[in-house]
Interface confidence: low
């Protein structure tokens, strides 16, 4: 029995009511004053929350009853107050006292997983014992009441890959898993209370365990040989085709780099980061006529491989790529970048100038036709032979710049042009001449040996070395000449008087024939007339007045 703190005489046991009792009234216990002698003069009263509604008291005996079903998980204790009154006097026999009724637990709640849904990610190929996730169930029953809330965890689905620690709910890997075979697992966990004893309640939950990828697969070419084609006209940088390796991994672990093991001079491979295809790129132009196919060896490796996964990537996958070069109809090609020919001037019509040659670089060698653009002087035949169609005069044109085109007979769209330079070589076809018109004057009283005129000559011919001119008087003039010529041997000559005194009245003008020869082979000679006027000179022997008079006459003035 229990006496209250004040030791005033209240006597009661600890009160417990089992929850979920189905009886209409359940005896909880009895309140009693030790002053009660059983003559029914005492009256017991119950006060506080629940008094009268949940709990009632037999006023005569102090017996307390629960008249409603209780749920410990809703409320586990009730605090009430007790009074005892002497019914004869109406006065309290004992001071009012507080007491507690506890609701005792029964196992009426199953374990619940409150944190659902569970999802965990763990790397594939993780070793046994790797922690995946901890699941925790909650049981609303009283943990202090027997085993009602003592839980044990077990695996209903998930063996042999996973295991669970029975008391902690920690899920661990019990067998290595390969994401490439299966990438997610549904594990079903059961939590049982009563530590699994009979009458236990249970709850289940599902855990979705996803395997994250590790780079345990290297990329592999599915094909031993890929066939690609490229036109010989394709510029460098052209994408000529794709090759593909397959990697069972995903994301970053499936990123790959392609490379060419050989002939990296002509081709390259880049990775398309979106599709992970290898794009074969032309690095250097190809020529069908030089090489019509290539066999290249390509390999592929993952871009990111951790050190501890290197064992999976020891040997890179390789494949062959056969690149067929497609023939493209190419224009003719001249043997030389330009041609230089020489021909003598005055060569007759139809003279051979030179020969050009172009060939079709394609396999199907097309015959070539030649033509000269806009030339009246030269023509070309289908053999590339250039001939003259008119005589050439170096003094009119010393050089001809021609453009010769070569056209494929089978495809007139294929045209090439080459510059041809024709130099017209000099022949000695011009005699030297006076370089200017000479009008000379001599005084009547001139003495013998007097220099009258210095003459020079020009020659329109081109000379390989310097021109050399030879000056002479004509045979007639030499016989009876009043004048002589002296060759200075520097392409000039001087005319001198060969007598003393001249007569203006008798012979006012002399016409001297000067022969000028060049040093060409054969030498050419011209006859040039030198006019010498006889003057009535002043005392000083000046021919100026004579010259002035000639000038006036030439202008139409008379002189006396």
């Amino acid at each position: 029995d229990y006496k209250d703190d004040d030791d005033k005489g209240w006597v009661w046991n600890q009160f417990f009511v089992p929850e979920e009792m189905n009886t209409t009234s359940h005896h909880v216990g009895r309140l009693r004053s030790d002053l009660d002698n059983g003559n029914n003069s005492f009256q017991y009263k119950l006060l506080g929350a629940g008094a009268g509604s949940i709990f009632v008291i037999d006023e005569r005996t102090g017996d307390i009853y629960a008249i409603q079903k209780l749920d410990r998980e809703e409320r586990s204790l009730y605090t009430l107050r007790a009074q005892v009154i002497d019914s004869t006097t109406g006065r309290a026999v004992e001071p009012e006292s507080e007491f507690v009724i506890r609701v005792s637990d029964i196992n009426d709640n199953e374990p619940k997983f409150l944190d659902e849904p569970y999802e965990a990610i763990v790397p594939e190929m993780s070793p046994e014992g790797t922690l995946v996730i901890q699941v925790t169930a909650t049981d609303a029953d009283d943990p202090a009441s027997g085993n009602n809330a003592r839980l044990l965890y077990s695996l209903l689905q998930g063996q042999p890959y996973f295991s669970i620690e029975p008391t902690t709910g920690v899920i661990r890997i019990s067998s290595k898993m390969d994401r490439e075979l299966q990438d997610e697992y549904w594990v079903i966990i059961q939590a049982k209370d009563m530590i699994g004893l009979p009458g236990a309640l249970s709850g289940t939950t599902s855990v979705l365990i996803k395997l994250s990828d590790v780079n345990d697969n290297k990329p592999i070419f599915k094909e031993r040989l890929y066939r690609l084609t490229v036109s010989e006209s394709a510029p460098t940088g052209t994408s000529i085709g794709r090759i593909m390796a397959y990697d069972n991994d995903i994301g970053e672990n499936a990123e790959m780099d392609y490379s060419i093991e050989d002939d990296s001079q002509t081709f390259d491979i880049i990775t398309n980061n979106e599709t992970q295809e290898g794009i074969v790129i032309l690095k250097k132009k190809v020529d069908f006529e030089h090489q019509n196919h290539y066999l290249i060896r390509a390999n592929v490796k993952n871009r990111h491989v951790a050190e501890h996964l290197m064992e999976y990537h020891v040997e890179a996958s390789t494949t062959f790529v056969r690149v067929q070069v497609e023939d493209e109809d190419e224009p003719p090609v001249f043997l030389l970048p330009y041609y230089l020919f020489e021909i003598l001037e005055e060569s007759p019509h139809g003279s051979f100038v030179g020969m050009v040659s172009a060939t079709d670089p394609d396999q199907r060698k097309s015959p070539i036709r030649y033509s000269i653009t806009r030339s009246k002087v030269f023509s070309i035949d289908d053999n590339g032979t250039i001939i003259t169609t008119n005589p050439l005069d170096r003094e009119i044109s010393a050089w001809y710049n021609l453009s010769i085109t070569a056209t494929e007979k089978y495809n007139v769209q294929q045209i090439s042009a080459v510059p041809v330079y024709v130099q017209v070589l000099n022949i000695n076809d011009h005699a030297p001449e006076f370089s200017e018109y000479y009008d000379s004057y001599v005084c009547e009283n001139a003495g013998s040996g007097q220099v009258i005129q210095t003459i020079s000559a020009v020659d329109r011919d081109e000379s390989v070395e310097d021109h050399h001119f030879y000056f002479n008087l004509s045979v007639e003039d030499t016989k009876n000449s009043s004048f002589i010529i002296i060759d200075n041997e520097d392409n000039t000559a001087v005319i001198l008087t060969n007598r003393t005194g001249f007569s203006l009245q008798e012979e006012p003008v002399f016409y001297i024939s000067v022969l000028i020869a060049d040093n060409g082979i054969p030498s050419l000679t011209s006859t040039n007339t030198l006019t010498i006027h006889i003057c009535d000179c002043d005392d000083y022997g000046s021919t100026q007045t004579c010259r002035d008079k000639d000038l006036l006459l030439s202008m139409g003035f008379r002189t006396e």
Epitope: K222, E223, L225, Y226, R227, M244
Partner: antibody, heavy 120, light 111 residues
């Protein structure tokens, strides 16, 4: 143009086997996979399996595993599909279809089909 | 039942636009190319669309294909009477390690 020519119609009794041929021409036979697809009367298309003629590698649909055998003869550019333990539900038109250079690439050319009737 | 789901029938009048859908999963449409085949009555199937959206030569540009996630669709614009046929989607399935076809959609051109 690629051509796939299949053998003629067959009538078989339940429990027997049938071997359908598919002769390929006008392409490099050894470069492409060949699949077999069947179509029961009034039904959809059903993939049976695939063979790579150069190495003879095969992959069969789970449903036909153990009953179907696919072979290739590179000398005649012909693939064969043999289906054993025939039952009435195997009555269908059987097509060969040229695949790509990868298992997972589309079928671009189809044979004209071979009707196999299984009846007692 | 098929791994790929197609509605069994579709219809439209000449000139209309019709869309046929094909639904799959991550292991097939989600990670591989989708192809579409047209089967005219009494003939072998014919490739209509390959690698999601490419048309073989000879297929009019009225036919177009697209893919998003684990679904694909075939659109036919300017519908013509000769388009009346069965249409099948097909794709490689990584999990099954084999090809799978949709159940087929019968397209009827009305009027």
């Amino acid at each position: 143009q690629v051509q796939l020519v299949q053998s003629g119609a067959e009538v078989k009794k339940p429990g027997a086997s049938v071997k359908v041929s598919c002769k390929a021409s006008r392409y490099t036979f050894t470069s492409y996979y060949m699949s077999w697809v069947r179509q029961a009367p009034g039904q959809g298309l059903e993939w049976m399996g695939i063979i790579h003629p150069s190495g003879g590698d095969t992959t069969y649909a789970q449903k036909f595993q153990g009953r179907v055998t696919m072979t290739g003869d590179t000398s005649t550019s012909t693939v064969y599909m043999e289906l054993s333990s025939l039952r009435s539900e195997d009555t269908a038109v059987y097509y060969c279809a040229r695949g790509g250079i990868k298992l997972w690439l589309h079928f671009d050319y189809w044979g004209q089909g071979t009707l196999v009737t299984v009846s007692s | 039942h098929s791994v790929l789901t197609q509605s069994p029938s579709a219809s439209g009048t000449p000139g209309q636009r019709v869309t046929i859908s094909c639904s799959g999963s991550r292991s097939n449409i989600g990670s591989n190319f989708v192809n579409w085949y047209q089967q005219l009555p009494g003939t072998a199937p014919k490739l209509l669309i390959y690698t999601n959206n490419q048309r073989p030569s000879g297929v009019p540009d009225r036919f177009s294909g697209s893919k998003s996630g684990t679904s694909a669709s075939l659109a036919i614009s300017g519908l013509q009477s000769e388009d009346e046929a069965d249409y099948y989607c097909a794709v490689w399935d990584d999990s099954l390690n084999g090809w799978v076809f949709g159940g087929g959609t019968k397209l009827t051109v009305l009027g």
